[in-house]
Interface confidence: medium
Amino acid sequence: APVPPGEDSKDVAAPHRQPLTSSERIDKQIRYILDGISALRKETCNKSNMCESSKEALAENNLNLPKMAEKDGCFQSGFNEETCLVKIITGLLEFEVYLEYLQNRFESSEEQARAVQMSTKVLIQFLQKKAKNLDAITTPDPTTNASLLTKLQAQNQWLQDMTTHLILRSFKEFLQSSLRALRQM
């Protein structure tokens, strides 16, 4: 697994560097998670032909993965810092069950999958400290998550491969969109 943010050789070699601001730490954390996703996607794409599947076929999958939309206030048109931050945190919380699903889906990248999951938890904590309106953040229901996890794990092999690919792709896109929005804050 990659070295967690703040512990790369560059940082070790430059102890005189200014400490990271909250925004820089969040930025770095997201990029660290994205690196992990890249490694997981590599294994998935090497193992199956899911990465070549057409978008139409992917769209047929009934996963309810979080996605940014205009109303979330994360785009330049209608940008709203607080609404957007709530969307990012809520979305990450919703992704957690899917990241749990990924835990047993990798052979050579098992450690990487765990690192992505744990780093996402840390990112959520960072963002919660930044948010003013924590009451607006809805936490997914644990019972609903448990039954969703059971349902996903009961799928046939092809569907499980497709689900893994979809989760990784959607999580990557959600994080990149979040990164873009957070840089406006």
């Epitope: 601001t21 690196d35 996605k67 969109s177």
Partner: antibody
Framework: EVQLVQSGGGLIQPGGSLRLSCAAS????????MIWVRQAPGKGLEWVSD????????YYADSVKGRFTMSRDISKNTVYLQMNSLRAEDTGVYYC??????????????WGRGTLVTVSS | DIVMTQSPSTLSASVGDRVTITCRAS??????LAWYQQKPGRAPKVLIY???TLESGVPSRFSGSGSGTDFTLTISSLQPEDFATYYC?????????FGQGTKLEIK
């Protein structure tokens, strides 16, 4: 070969409209950031707008916000810049470009050849 | 908005010289900086991205360094084809901003 072919420039009167096109080949615009950068005669580079593939959301420089609209046609693998209420200060060469952003490397890696827009009466 | 200040605006040098162009950001941009070279009548081309990563195919005489707010582009031994205008660009947040450019001319 990865390339961007631009068209649509020309001479236009102040207050007029113009649409620039940028056809991509060798890659798909539906999975890339696309941007427009302009350069006034004898001046430096100025970012105009960008379009993020994931949700199709666009960002604009303050100088063009409300007047310019960036859009895409995925079936034609083409991006557009619709320019309305043109002003003399919009004169310059407009470059269409691809923004390579894989979160760890972020820079403009492919540029069109540019198209000249002249706003004058 | 982030403002990029490049210096000098014009630089006169000779073939074989070592030259340095600097770029300062008005706020920390980590390593989100690229350097572009532009020749008259041509589109710019990337030389360096992520502050110090050399773009594939770019000669090794070009190098970049810096992080946070201060960045430099160095050409170790100027070649005739290097006389051009150089721009730094902050690729951190919209609005993406370019420095005003440094024109490198023959002494």
């Amino acid at each position: 070969e990865v390339q961007l072919v631009q068209s649509g420039g020309g001479l236009i009167q102040p207050g007029g409209s113009l649409r620039l096109s940028c056809a991509a080949s060798g890659f798909t615009i539906s999975s890339n950031y696309m941007i427009w950068v302009r350069q006034a005669p004898g001046k430096g580079l100025e970012w105009v707008s960008d379009l993020y593939y994931y949700a199709g959301d666009t960002y604009y420089a303050d100088s063009v916000k409300g007047r310019f609209t960036m859009s895409r046609d995925i079936s034609k693998n083409t991006v557009y810049l619709q320019m309305n209420s043109l002003r003399a200060e919009d004169t310059g060469v407009y470059y269409c470009a691809r923004w390579a952003d894989d979160h760890n490397n972020t820079y403009i890696d492919v540029w069109g050849r540019g198209t000249l827009v002249t706003v004058s009466s | 908005d982030i403002v990029m200040t490049q210096s000098p605006s014009t630089l006169s040098a000779s073939v074989g010289d070592r030259v340095t162009i600097t770029c300062r950001a008005s706020q920390g941009i980590s390593s989100w900086l690229a350097w572009y070279q532009q020749k008259p009548g041509r589109a710019p081309k990337v030389l360096i991205y992520k502050a110090s990563t050399l773009e594939s195919g770019v000669p090794s005489r070009f190098s970049g360094s810096g992080s946070g707010t201060d960045f430099t582009l160095t050409i170790s031994s100027l070649q005739p084809e290097d006389f051009a205008t150089y721009y730094c660009a902050a690729h951190y947040a919209a609005p993406w901003t370019f420095g005003q450019g440094t024109k490198l001319e023959i002494k």
